[in-house]
């Protein structure tokens, strides 16, 4: 990019550059029309009467350099051929010299700085490539010369350009003073500011465009060359922020539209909102869940929103004494998640209707919560108690939902407790045909023992037809009609209002061989 410091083609007023010395044959300003019929200013000099060695100087106004270190001067000029000049002397030249002088302000006058090389700095002696020829009575013909010179390095606030004629017949048609700069650039979401090169190449730090963030260290940089061009190299280091996607050939980060989102820094595009979510605003890094839908903390932003599951279905129970097995079916609605678990809560309800959490002696297998299979075994149920079990299905968002999770209840009432097994049977008397047995009264938990049932059979005779039963209301019994000298296996069970308890261990007893030993007391 070229930044103009002075362009005489664009000047609408007199240039009024300074000439030296104040004598005839000096540079003079003319006005004319360019190709577009716009008014333009030029300077002419053609002093064929001048004494040898006398130079004519023309100096521009003070030009602020505006940070430029090297300034370029494009000069358009025509030069008369010495041979075609009628009064041309031997001192006629077809060249001119360009100088510059630096200063911190517009301090030059008609006499200062001294009109000579040093203080003026010589740039170049310019020779015409094309000469203009003029024949008597005819218009001058010849091509315009264009020469671009490089001034610098410059360090002061501004400068003057000066032209020295030492015998040329020429016209300075236009002067364009400019410097080269790298124009601002946006590439790969990185903004590089307009930069005036101070050296052959200058590193320029870039900054991320709006709504982009740095993704690398150090910050992205690009080199501005002296010719005002950016060095071609790959620029990386900026990516669009969450909620924004690259657009317009990686020049801007555009906000994600309604109904779309982008969750992380990066070059990805905005995506439609996942199921059960929405984004009402532009530039959303995340889509918000619909009412009743949630994301677990561990769920990525790109995952759908989910809801807690419905209650488990068809809870069935199998009661076996103090052990209960509950089984159920999976809920109809999983909530859109796969991390389904179950939890079982137990409450003990009194006849009056008040319920309390179940006691601590109850155990759950494999546990009361985090169940992945649809069953649980519960041990330690007390007899004659109504329990309410609530089976709930849970998933990763159940804790985020307001209100308790839906559950399926089941009521289970345990049987009243039967007496314990009768053991410690003693034979108090035996005879060849009878046995008198006694036992300790068992401690029945729910009411007194009403009666007992004695089960006995001869040892070795195991079939159902050989087993005999005897009921007694006391804790003793006489077994009659037994075989002499035979062995019998005896079991006793007690009955309370809750029913019969279990038979105790088999007790081994033997009848006598003869009467003499009859009624002999013996211990079991």
């Amino acid at each position: 990019l070229e930044e103009t410091l002075l362009n005489t083609k664009l000047e609408t007023a007199d240039l009024k550059w300074v000439t030296y010395p104040q004598a005839e044959g000096q540079w003079e300003e003319l006005s004319g029309l360019d190709e577009e019929q716009h008014s333009v200013r030029t300077y002419e000099v053609c002093d064929m009467k001048r004494p040898g060695g006398q130079a004519h100087w023309l100096r521009t106004g003070w030009v602020p350099r505006r940070g430029a270190v090297h300034v370029y001067a494009t000069i358009r000029f025509t030069m008369m051929e010495c041979l075609s000049l009628p009064r041309a002397s031997r001192s006629c030249k077809e060249t001119f010299t360009v100088f510059y002088y630096e200063s911190e302000a517009d301090t030059a006058t008609a006499h200062t700085p001294a009109w000579m090389e040093n203080p003026y700095i010589k740039v170049d002696t310019v020779a015409a490539e094309h000469l203009t020829r003029k024949r008597p009575g005819a218009e001058a013909t010849g091509k315009v010369n264009i020469k671009t010179l490089r001034l610098g390095p410059l360090s002061k606030a501004g400068f003057y350009l000066a032209f020295q004629d030492q015998g040329a017949c020429m016209a300075l048609l236009s002067l364009h003073l400019f410097y080269k700069k790298c124009s601002w650039l946006i590439t790969n979401l990185t903004y590089f500011p307009e930069t005036v090169p101070r050296e052959l190449v200058v590193p320029v730090a870039g900054s991320c465009v709006a709504n982009a963030v740095p993704t690398a260290n150090p910050s992205p940089s690009l080199y501005c060359r002296e010719d005002g061009q950016w060095a071609e190299q790959q620029v990386t280091g900026c990516s669009c922020a969450p909620g924004y996607e690259a657009a317009e050939s990686n020049k801007v980060c555009r906000a994600c539209g309604q109904g779309t989102f982008k969750p992380q820094i990066g070059d990805e595009s905005c995506l439609p909102c996942p199921a059960n979510s929405h984004s009402n605003n532009i530039g959303s890094p995340v889509c918000l869940c619909r009412i009743g839908y949630y994301r677990a903390r561990s769920d990525p932003r790109s995952s759908p929103c989910t809801t807690p599951p419905s209650a488990p279905r068809s809870v069935v129970h199998h009661l076996n004494g103090s052990t209960l097995r509950l089984e159920w079916s999976a809920p109809l609605e999983s909530g859109g998640r796969e991390d389904l678990t179950y939890a079982v809560r137990c409450r003990e309800c009194r006849p009056g209707g008040s319920c309390l959490p179940c006691g601590g002696d109850m155990t759950f297998d494999p546990g009361p919560r985090d169940l992945v299979e649809p069953w649980v075994a519960i041990r330690g149920l007390r007899p004659d108690v109504t329990y309410t079990f609530e089976v709930a299905a849970l998933n990763g968002v159940s804790t985020l939902a307001t209100g308790p999770p839906p559950f399926e209840p089941v009521n289970v009432t345990t049987d009243r407790e039967v007496p314990p097994a009768v053991s410690d049977i003693r034979v108090t008397r035996s005879s060849p045909s009878s046995l008198i047995l006694s036992w300790a009264i068992p401690r029945a938990p729910s009411g007194a023992v009403l009666d007992y049932e004695v089960k006995y059979h001869e040892k070795g005779a195991e079939g159902p037809s050989s087993v005999r039963f005897l009921k007694t209301s006391e804790n003793r019994a006489e077994l009659r009609g037994l075989k002499r000298g035979a062995s019998y296996l005896v079991q006793v069970r007690a009955r309370s209002e809750a029913g019969y308890g279990p038979f105790g261990q088999e007790h081994h007893s033997q009848t006598q061989l003869d009467e003499s030993e009859s009624w002999r007391e013996q211990l079991a």
């Epitope: 609408t12 007199d14 003319l30 006005s31 002419e44 053609c46 008369m80 218009e139 016209a171």
Partner: antibody
């Protein structure tokens, strides 16, 4: 010798027309930018119109725009001013004047008048 | 367009210095030319480009221009210098020409 000679002045009624001529001699007319300048009796100088050497561009003072036309015939070394819709306030001595010439490029001219004619009187009266 | 203002008259004794002013906004940024017109004659260029003298014009004529004022100076004024003097400049369009109202220089005695 280098000179400009105007002609064509005279008495004309308001609304009438007149054509002034300026004959150039002694210099390369076809390289020169030319102008007309007028001077009302007892008043100062007033620029009227310009024409470039090749007639590529003409300019007029606001007071005469649309009524006066400047032209030239380089083959005859003559400058013209066609005056139409004349008014009493157009009464003046009309001078033709040459702009300072470029050494060799007729596309350019200096901004001063370095050669004047003796003038011709135009009187607009009924 | 720029307006150029001149004093209607200036008087000077022979041999003295006469100064005729011409003022206008930022006139110093424009080139000013001066014309001498004697009664019944055509104008003659006496100073151009602020301070340059055409060949044939006596050295006693000089000019300057800065700020808002251009000045024509006649050193050692002579009786033959008695005339009307007009300043002139191009307007910013560079194609229209403006003249000052003119100053009558009277050489006393």
């Amino acid at each position: 010798q280098v000179q400009l000679v105007e002609s064509g002045g005279g008495l004309v009624q308001p609304g009438g027309s007149l054509r002034l001529s300026c004959a150039a001699s002694g210099f390369t007319f076809n390289n020169s930018w030319m102008s007309w300048v007028r001077q009302a009796p007892g008043k100062g100088l007033e620029w009227v119109s310009n024409i470039t050497s090749s007639s590529s561009m003409t300019h007029y003072a606001d007071s005469v725009k649309g009524r006066f036309t400047i032209s030239r015939d380089n083959s005859k070394n003559t400058l013209y001013l066609q005056m139409n819709s004349l008014r009493a306030e157009d009464t003046a001595v009309y001078y033709c004047a040459r702009k300072g010439m470029s050494f060799y490029n007729n596309k350019y001219a200096k901004s001063m008048f370095d050669l004047w004619g003796q003038g011709t009187l135009v009187t607009v009266s009924s | 367009d720029i307006e150029l203002t001149q004093p209607p008259s200036v008087s000077v004794a022979p041999g003295q210095t006469a100064r005729i002013s011409c003022s206008g906004d930022n006139l110093g940024k424009k080139y000013v030319h001066w014309y001498q017109q004697k009664p019944g004659q055509a104008p003659v260029l006496v100073i151009y480009y602020d301070s340059k003298r055409p060949s044939g014009i006596p050295e006693r004529f000089s000019g300057s221009n800065s700020g808002n004022t251009a000045t024509l100076t006649i050193s050692g004024t002579q009786a033959e210098d008695e005339a009307d003097y007009y300043c002139s400049a191009w307007t910013t369009t560079m194609m229209h020409i403006v003249f000052g109202g003119g100053t009558k220089l009277t050489v006393l005695g």
